[in-house]
C-alpha cells in the first residue's frame, strides 16, 4: 500500500475535470493537501497533484493553509511512519513520533496546538515497524488564520497521497 | 467493548423512526456502513442494520459505495484488529495490518488509494494484542465513482458496529 | 507537544471574538469539548475553555452532549494515553486502553456504542509509552439524544486541549 498513487498523466486527467458542485449546495471553502514525496527530510504540503485541491478561497502559503473566511471548520491530518530492521544502532530507547496541527492567528502571537497525536516506537524491539496517526476536529477560525503542521520523526514518513495528508473544510 | 451492539429488535426500532432532517438544511448524500459480523473471513459492508444508513442517493453495490452526485465528499473508515499468539512460531515474523479506502472511477481504469493506514504487530512479543486504525479526508468525487476498501488482516478484525465502519457524506 | 495550550488570558481573548459565521451558510449545531486537565482521575468534558465551544443548540449536561435537533451528525473523539513503568512487576500483564463514544436515547434504555477504539500496551516491555486513539463517523440522531464517552485507562490520559477532545456537528 505505501507509495501507491496515480501516474502523473492519470493524476492530471483527474484534475482536469471542471470544478464539481453539488446541485443543492453553494460552494464552501475546502482543502486537501498531500505531502510532497520528493522531499524526504521535510514535510512540504502540495495542492496541485493527485487528489489534492484548494477550493473557494483556501490558499497555501509558507506551507500553511490560509483560512479564507471566518466560521467553523473541520480540520484533519494523517501521517504514516515506518522504519526498517537495524535502523537504530547502539540504543533500545524508543523513537518519539508526533504530529500536530497548529493555528497561528492575529489574535495571539504564537502557534496554538489544535490537534496532537503522539507515539513511542521501539525500533530495536520491533522491526520493521509501521505506525499511522490521524486526527481531526471542528474549530472556530477567523479569516486570515494560518493552519500548519509540526511533525517529529519526518525522516520516517511514508510519503504517498493516501498516507500523509492535511485538510480542512467549512461546516 | 468489542462486539457490543444493539439487540436486533432495538436496532429495528432505531431504524423505524422516519428519516430525520435538520429543519434548516436540505438533505445531502450521506452513508455509514458497518462490517457484517456474521462473515468472519471477509469484510462485507452492510447498510440495513444497527446505526448504518444510506441517504439521498448513496447506494451499496458489489461491496462498494456508489457516489450519487458530483462534488466534494468527506470519506472515512475505521477497523479494529485483535489477536492472540497461537504458537511460538509467531514470534519471529510480524503481522502486516492495513486498511485502505480506494476509488474506482470511469476516469482511469484502476483502483486509486485515497486513504491508507498500516501497522506491523508482533504477536509473539505482545499477546493478546489489539489495534485500531482510522482515517478520513475530503475528496472531489464524480457521479458514479465507486468507493471500496481493501484490508490486510481480515481474520483479525473485531467486527462490531462501533469498531469496523466505512462512510461518506457530501460537504 | 503534550500539555501545550493557551495561557488562560490568551484563551479568553480567543473566545471573546464575536460568534463567526460563514457569509454563505446558516449556522448549524456544532460542539467541540476538551478534557479538563485539572481532573486527573476522571474525564470531564469542558466547553468554556481554550478552543472548545457549543453552538446553535448543543449543550453539555452530566458530561454528555445533548443533541439539539434531529438529523445526521458527524461525531468524533480523540484520546492520548501515556505511561512509564516504575517496576519490573509491570512486565507480566498488559494494560487495556479503550475509548468509546456512546449514545443514550429515549428509543431504548441503554447506552449504545457508536465508536470504539482499543489497544493493549505492555508497559514493562516498552517504557515510556505513548498511544493515540481517534475515531469519528456520521450518525442519524434524534433531538434529545445524549452523546457521552467511556474510557478505560483514564489515569494514563494526556489531558491537553489538543490531545483529548470530543465533538459533533450537524451535516
Amino acid at each position: 500500500l505505501p507509495g501507491v498513487g496515480l501516474t502523473p498523466s492519470a493524476a492530471q486527467t483527474a484534475r482536469q475535470h471542471p470544478k464539481m458542485h453539488l446541485a443543492h449546495s453553494t460552494l464552501k471553502p475546502a482543502a486537501h493537501l498531500i505531502g510532497d514525496p520528493s522531499k524526504q527530510n521535510s514535510l512540504l504540503w502540495r495542492a496541485n497533484t493527485d487528489r489534492a485541491f484548494l477550493q473557494d478561497g483556501f490558499s497555501l502559503s509558507n506551507n500553511s493553509l490560509l483560512v479564507p473566511t471566518s466560521g467553523i471548520y473541520f480540520v484533519y491530518s494523517q501521517v504514516v511512519f515506518s522504519g526498517k530492521a537495524y535502523s537504530p544502532k547502539a540504543t533500545s530507547s524508543p523513537l518519539y513520533l508526533a504530529h500536530e496541527v497548529q493555528l497561528f492567528s492575529s489574535q495571539y502571537p504564537f502557534h496554538v496546538p489544535l490537534l496532537s497525536s503522539q507515539k513511542m516506537v521501539y525500533p530495536g524491539l520491533q522491526e520493521p515497524w509501521l505506525h499511522s496517526m490521524y486526527h481531526g476536529a471542528a474549530f472556530q477560525l477567523t479569516q486570515g488564520d494560518q493552519l500548519s503542521t509540526h511533525t517529529d520523526g519526518i525522516p520516517h514518513l511514508v510519503l504517498s497521497p493516501s498516507t500523509v495528508f492535511f485538510g480542512a473544510f467549512a461546516l | 467493548l468489542p462486539g457490543v451492539g444493539l439487540t436486533p429488535s432495538a436496532a429495528q426500532t432505531a431504524r423505524q423512526h422516519p428519516k430525520m432532517h435538520l429543519a434548516h438544511s436540505t438533505l445531502k448524500p450521506a452513508a455509514h456502513l458497518i462490517g457484517d459480523p456474521s462473515k468472519q473471513n471477509s469484510l462485507l459492508w452492510r447498510a440495513n442494520t444497527d446505526r448504518a444508513f444510506l441517504q439521498d442517493g448513496f447506494s451499496l453495490s458489489n461491496n462498494s459505495l456508489l457516489v450519487p452526485t458530483s462534488g466534494i465528499y468527506f470519506v472515512y473508515s475505521q477497523v479494529v484488529f485483535s489477536g492472540k499468539a497461537y504458537s511460538p512460531k509467531a514470534t519471529s515474523s510480524p503481522l502486516y495490518l492495513a486498511h485502505e479506502v480506494q476509488l474506482f472511477s470511469s476516469q482511469y481504469p484502476f483502483h486509486v488509494p485515497l486513504l491508507s493506514s498500516q501497522k506491523m504487530v508482533y504477536p509473539g512479543l505482545q499477546e493478546p494484542w489489539l489495534h485500531s486504525m482510522y482515517h478520513g479526508a475530503a475528496f472531489q468525487l464524480t457521479q458514479g465513482d465507486q468507493l471500496s476498501t481493501h484490508t490486510d488482516g481480515i481474520p483479525h478484525l473485531v467486527l462490531s458496529p462501533s469498531t469496523v465502519f466505512f462512510g461518506a457524506f457530501a460537504l | 507537544l503534550p500539555g501545550v495550550g493557551l495561557t488562560p488570558s490568551a484563551a479568553q481573548t480567543a473566545r471573546q471574538h464575536p460568534k463567526m459565521h460563514l457569509a454563505h451558510s446558516t449556522l448549524k449545531p456544532a460542539a467541540h469539548l476538551i478534557g479538563d486537565p485539572s481532573k486527573q482521575n476522571s474525564l470531564l468534558w469542558r466547553a468554556n475553555t481554550d478552543r472548545a465551544f457549543l453552538q446553535d443548540g448543543f449543550s453539555l449536561s452530566n458530561n454528555s452532549l445533548l443533541v439539539p435537533t434531529s438529523g445526521i451528525y458527524f461525531v468524533y473523539s480523540q484520546v492520548v494515553f501515556s505511561g512509564k513503568a516504575y517496576s519490573p512487576k509491570a512486565t507480566s500483564s498488559p494494560l487495556y486502553l479503550a475509548h468509546e463514544v456512546q449514545l443514550f436515547s429515549s428509543q431504548y434504555p441503554f447506552h449504545v456504542p457508536l465508536l470504539s477504539s482499543q489497544k493493549m500496551v505492555y508497559p514493562g516491555l516498552q517504557e515510556p509509552w505513548l498511544h493515540s486513539m481517534y475515531h469519528g463517523a456520521a450518525f442519524q440522531l434524534t433531538q434529545g439524544d445524549q452523546l457521552s464517552t467511556h474510557t478505560d485507562g483514564i489515569p494514563h490520559l494526556v489531558l491537553s486541549p489538543s490531545t483529548v477532545f470530543f465533538g459533533a456537528f450537524a451535516l
Epitope: 508526533a98 513511542m120 525500533p123 | - | 505513548l130
Partner: antibody, heavy 114, light 113 residues
Framework: EVQLVESGGGLVQPGGSLRLSCAAS????????IEWVRQAPGKGLEWVGE????????NYNEEFKGRATFSADNSKNTAYLQMNSLRAEDTAVYYC???????WGQGTLVTVSS | DIQMTQSPSSLSASVGDRVTITCKSS????????????LAWYQQKPGKAPKLLIY???TRDSGVPSRFSGSGSGTDFTLTISSLQPEDFATYYC?????????FGQGTKVEIK
C-alpha cells in the same frame, strides 16, 4: 552527517552548579534520545542518563537522580545537562551521544575544585 | 543493574597480531523475540570521544574496517581484531543497552608490545 558538540564545561567550586549544552546538527533532533556519559580522568565510562527531546521523557541513572537534570530546546536542536551540588568526584569529561545514529560529541571537561 | 566485566584489563600485542577481548554480562542481553543481543563495542583513543565499532553484538558500524568483528550471544561476547594495525592501539569498551541504567565494561587497553 550527524554531529554533536558539547560546551559549558570549566572549573566549578564544590557545591556549585553547571549547565552543559549539547548542540546537534545533521539530523532531525526531536525524535532521537540524547544520552549523557561521563569519564573521570583515567577511568572508564559511566552512563548518566538520557532525554527524548520531543517528548521530554527522561531516564536517569539512580546514582545521579536529584543532582542531574536533563532538558532540551527543540528550536535550538540543543540538549542540556544541569548538574547541582557538585563534588570533587564529579570531575570528568562529559559526553553527549545519540545511540540511534551511533554519534558522540567531543566531550567537555568539568573540574570541581576549590 | 547489569554488570559488565571485560577481560583482560590490558594486553600487549604487535602489529599483525590477532587480538580477542571478551565481555561478560551478569544477565542475558539476548532479546528472544527478535534474537538480537543489545550489546555495543567502542574504541577510545586518548583525549578523544569513544567511537562506535559494533552494535547488536555483531553489526559493524559504517566505515569500520572489516578486521573488527563482534560475536557471542546471551552473556558472553567477543571483540576480535583479526590483524592489529598501528591505529588500533586504544582502549575498548563493551556496553549493554538491554536495560537501564546502561552500563559499560571497565575497558581493555591494547598497547604496543
Amino acid at each position: 552527517e550527524v554531529q554533536l558538540v558539547e560546551s559549558g564545561g570549566g572549573l566549578v567550586q564544590p557545591g556549585g552548579s553547571l549547565r552543559l549544552s549539547c548542540a546537534a546538527s545533521g539530523y532531525t533532533f526531536s525524535s532521537y534520545w540524547i544520552e549523557w556519559v561521563r569519564q573521570a580522568p583515567g577511568k572508564g565510562l559511566e552512563w548518566v542518563g538520557e532525554i527524548s527531546p520531543g517528548s521530554g521523557s527522561t531516564n536517569y541513572n539512580e546514582e545521579f537522580k536529584g543532582r542531574a537534570t536533563f532538558s532540551a530546546d527543540n528550536s535550538k536542536n540543543t540538549a542540556y545537562l544541569q548538574m547541582n551540588s557538585l563534588r570533587a568526584e564529579d570531575t570528568a569529561v562529559y559526553y553527549c551521544a545519540d545511540g540511534y545514529h551511533g554519534a558522540w560529541g567531543q566531550g567537555t571537561l568539568v573540574t570541581v575544585s576549590s | 543493574d547489569i554488570q559488565m566485566t571485560q577481560s583482560p584489563s590490558s594486553l600487549s600485542a604487535s602489529v599483525g597480531d590477532r587480538v580477542t577481548i571478551t565481555c561478560k554480562s551478569s544477565q542475558s542481553l539476548l532479546y528472544s523475540t527478535n534474537q538480537k543481543n543489545f550489546l555495543a563495542w567502542y574504541q577510545q583513543k586518548p583525549g578523544k570521544a569513544p567511537k562506535l565499532l559494533i552494535y547488536w553484538a555483531s553489526t559493524r558500524d559504517s566505515g569500520v574496517p572489516s578486521r573488527f568483528s563482534g560475536s557471542g550471544s546471551g552473556t558472553d561476547f567477543t571483540l576480535t581484531i583479526s590483524s592489529l594495525q598501528p591505529e588500533d592501539f586504544a582502549t575498548y569498551y563493551c556496553q549493554q543497552y538491554y536495560s537501564y541504567p546502561r552500563t559499560f565494561g571497565q575497558g581493555t587497553k591494547v598497547e604496543i608490545k
